[in-house]
Each structure stands twice: as C-alpha cells, then as structure tokens.
C-alpha cells in the first residue's frame, strides 16, 4: 500500500523504528543518542553544501514486537500487520531505519511499496537479500558464507596448504540475533556454503560438540560456531581436545580482541576466532560513552543509517530530483558515503562491504593475532601473519579431514 | 468491521491522568489491530499508540512514550489508553481505530472523545 510521506517542500522526515529487544539489547536511549548524533551531522553536511532544508526524525517504539527472550525469532507477523497499519494513517517519513530483526524486515518488505526505502541495522538472514529497496548496514550472513567458502578452498599459504571441503556447524538454538541467522545460512541445504562443501553436519546439543572434541571416528577437524569466547569456554570448559580439531568462532561484533591488555585464555588456541576490523574513532565519541564493546556497531549501523540518508538527500537535492520517487529508494546502493567512522561501502544489493578479520592465539605471547583479513567487498583474502606461532603442528593449519596431513 | 465506541475524555489539569475506553462489538475483537490516534485545531492527525490483537505487541509515538499506555481486554471487547503526566499539548480529540489483521489499513474509526489539558 502507498505510504504518504513527510518529505517535501525543505522538510525531510526519517522514521526510526526503536524495537525493545532488537537485534542486540541494546537500550533505546542510546540508540536514540546515535541517530540524534547522526542527524548534527547530516545537517551540518547539508548546510555545507549549501542547501538550506531541515532533517529530523520520529521515533515509534514498540516494546513487544519481538519477546522477552530478547530475540527475534518469535517477531510475528501480527507486530508488522500493526506497523503497516499505523504507516498508512498517518504520515511517514522518507525513509524507514529499523526493523533489525530478519523476520520483521522480511515481511515488511513484502508488505511495503517499493517507493519507501527501508535501512537496516541487521535484518541478517538470507531472506533478506536481494531486496531492491532495503539497505543493511551490518554484515549480513550472505558475506559470512563467501568468506568462510572462500577460506576452505585457500590451499596456497604457508599456514594452509590444504582446500577444506568438510565442516561441522554447531547450533544449539540459544544463539544471538546476528548468530542465529549466519548458523542458518550455513545450515541451509540450498546455499552456496552447502553446495560447496562436500560434507557438513549440524551439531545440535552441547554433548554432540563435546563428544567430537577427541571422537576418532569423527568426519570433519573443522567446527564452526558463532558467539564471544565466554560461550566457547561455557560449552568446551577444559576438556581435552584433539590436536587437530580447529574450531571457527565467528564473533563479528566485538572489539575486545583488540583491546591491549586482552590475553586469550588458554582454551582458546585451537580456535580461529573471525570478527570485524574495529573502529578508530568511536571510544571517544559522545554516543558511545555508555556502549559496550559488542554494541558499538549495533548504534553505530544507526548512526551510520542517518548519515547514509544525508548523503542521499544531499545527492538528489543538488540533482533536483523527487525524494519521493521510486529511483530515490531504489539509489541506496553501490555506493560510498562517508560514514561516522570513516567511508561506508554498500554492494550492489544495499549491503554493507567490511573486512574481516582471522584472528588466531600465538602461543608464544598468549595474545590474539591477525593471522588474516578478508575484503568483503572484492572476495579476496590477504594474509598477514606468514609465520604464525600456531598450536598446530608444523604451524599449519591441519586437513580437514582426519588422517591426513599434518597431524 | 467492528463499531467503536470512545469514553472517558473530559477536562483535566496539567500532570493529571485520564483513562480512555474504546469499547467494540463484533466477535472477532481479538483479530483486530487497535489503535489511538489524536487530531489538534488545525494539526494533521498524529498517532499516539497502538496495539496487536493479541496485546503482545505495541507501538507508542516519541511523544508520549512513557507517559501513556496502550492496552486490552479481549474479554470485554474494549481497548484502553491510560494517560498519566497530560501537558497542555496533549490536548486534541481522541480516536479510536481497528483493523482486521492482514488488512493493510485501520478500517473502523470511532467519533473520538475530547481531552483537553489545562495549565
């Protein structure tokens, strides 16, 4: 259905959608905090620019459209039946940042006009993308899986002379937002992860994972999972584990890796621990100040959707082009704008372009290391560490497969 | 759709609260979306809260996030707007609005009850 939009005539509205339990548990004050952040700055901008317009934003809170489990997966379609309603009642604004969950988002977009740009700050799954007129501004589950695709079949570094093609995914159901959603696309049987691999099995309960740790008989060394050390050790605790079993922690959200008086614990160095390259800028900023480290990025895909508006607007003011037109909300893609933190890139379907970070623990310092990164934007890998101080033997990361290679 | 009926407006002062009644017949109340929607002197019309069939999800606007509260009872076929802490800005008509789920629209609307806040 049309949605009328307060966006003309010099005056241009963003309507924020704040979700309780979102994404992350984040609370709404400091999201609030980013956008009102983000929108000095885009004023600023415009000002700059010369273009004398006013920019601001409403913010509709719902406090139950995702429970108190404080995670999305029970984000029922009535809770967007609701917000539809309310859009056509009443005026909107010219684009809509939120919801986070990939529920949520999923069935908005089917529900929602074309012409109305949506941006959002999570939204992880693969049913997500491809949507012409949304845009994500974490990393979406679709970039984890080209990465991971990517680094089994690297078989031409120092470290990692062997193409893996096997792998054991540990999902147990508990998992956050952003985890649950990359452990489904990888457990996904139509997807590019599963067509590549030629072996792959699901780990459902905790003494399934603890039971491969030393089972001879088991098919794949490599475990996949998706949560901060503390879930690790939790789940691992000091059980003896095969020396050449690795375990993937995939933990994109947290900067602590990266904080200098961080030592990795001793249960951590049979794993790869996968994150994002963190941030300069942010420790300082005003909107941050009451952030953990695993939130930053959850207010800073808010802050950034505000400044991504901004460039926008800026773009098609000195066009003279229509904000309210189908062009303006499909235009929310392959592009660069300058984000908070530095230049934003979004692929050619909206979605956010990062790198990754391969982190493994040096057994000579107990630190955390950058063994790797990953451009997701170009599918390319580029080593760091030539001569990582590794657990595994030789320094090389083992074959996938029992038996053989280093062992 | 349903017939909505609203109730308990009147003159209050300024910090004081009302509670708005919104009762709806028909049977299947408990499919209906529901929502409070308010209307100043010459201001367009402005959503203030609204709630699921089920009452499990809400949404309130920034304005009154923490001073209202939207909620139902199935039961009686009726939806309420407590209003605590009113400011003169809180005066306007009150409506009353329901939609089927799956409807993309709130198809019923009531007369609206006036509130109006004094300083």
């Known amino acids: 259905s049309q949605v009328s939009q307060n966006c003309h005539n010099g005056s241009y509205e963003i309507s924020v959608l704040m979700m309780g339990n979102s994404a992350f548990a984040e609370p709404l004050k400091n999201l609030e905090d980013a956008v009102n952040e983000g929108l000095e700055i885009v004023r600023g901008r415009l000002q700059n620019a010369g273009l004398n317009v006013t920019v601001n934003a409403t913010f509709m809170y719902s406090d139950g459209l995702i429970h108190n489990s404080g995670d999305c997966r029970s984000s029922t379609c009535e809770g967007l039946d609701l917000l539809r309603k309310i859009s056509n009642a009443q005026r909107m604004g010219c684009v809509l940042i939120g919801p986070s969950c990939t529920y949520s988002t999923f069935q908005m977009y089917l529900d929602t006009e074309l012409s109305y740009p949506m941006i959002s700050a999570g939204s992880f799954g693969l049913s997500c993308d491809y949507k012409e007129t949304l845009t994500r501004l974490m990393s979406p589950a679709r970039k984890l899986m080209y990465f991971l695709v990517n680094f089994w079949k690297t078989n031409d570094l120092p470290f990692k002379t062997y193409s893996w093609s096997t792998s054991y995914v540990y999902k147990n159901g508990t998992e956050t937002e952003d985890c649950f959603w990359y452990l489904n696309a990888l457990e996904a049987s139509v997807s590019y992860f599963s067509h590549e691999l030629g072996f792959k099995v699901v780990l459902r309960q905790d003494k399934e994972f603890q039971d491969i740790l030393m089972d001879h008989n088991r098919k794949s060394n490599v475990i996949i999972m998706c949560g901060g050390p503390e879930f690790l050790y939790k789940l691992k605790g000091d059980r003896a584990v095969a020396e050449d079993i690795v375990i993937i922690l995939v933990d994109l959200f947290n900067d602590q890796y990266f904080e200098d008086n961080v030592t990795a614990p001793d249960y951590m160095k049979n794993v790869l621990v996968l994150t994002l390259s963190p941030g300069n800028s942010l420790l300082n900023s005003s909107f941050s100040r009451n952030l953990s480290p695993t939130k930053r990025d959850f207010a800073l895909a808010y802050l950034n959707g505000i400044l991504l508006f901004g460039h926008m607007l800026k773009i098609f003011l000195e066009n003279g082009e229509n904000i309210t037109t189908p062009k303006f909300a499909h235009a929310f893609r392959n592009l660069t704008f300058e984000g908070y933190d530095g230049p934003v890139t979004l692929d050619d379907w909206g979605d956010v372009d990062s790198t990754m970070v391969l982190l493994y623990t040096s057994v000579d310092t107990k630190k955390y290391k950058v063994l790797l990164t990953y451009d997701t934007h170009v599918n390319k890998t580029y080593p760091v560490d030539m001569s990582p101080t590794f657990t595994w033997k030789n320094s090389k990361l083992p074959n996938d497969i029992t038996g053989r290679g280093p062992q | 759709e349903v017939q909505l009926v609203e109730s308990g407006g009147g003159l209050v002062q300024a910090g004081g609260s009302l509670r708005l009644s919104c009762a709806a017949s028909?049977?299947?109340?408990?499919?209906?979306?529901m929502g409070w929607f308010r209307q100043a002197p010459g201001k367009e019309r402005e959503f203030v809260a609204a709630?699921?069939?089920?009452?499990?999800?809400?949404f309130y606007a920034h304005s009154v996030k923490g001073r209202f509260t939207i909620s139902r009872d199935n039961a009686k076929n009726t939806v309420y707007l407590q209003m605590n802490s009113l400011k003169p800005e809180d005066t306007a008509v009150y409506s009353c609005?329901?939609?089927?789920?799956?409807?993309?629209?709130?198809?019923?609307w009531g007369q609206g009850t006036q509130v109006t806040v004094s300083s």
């Open positions: 609005a329901g939609g089927a789920h799956g409807s993309p629209d709130f198809g019923s």
């Open positions: 028909g049977r299947t109340f408990s499919s209906y979306a």
């Open positions: 709630i699921s069939g089920s009452g499990g999800v809400t």
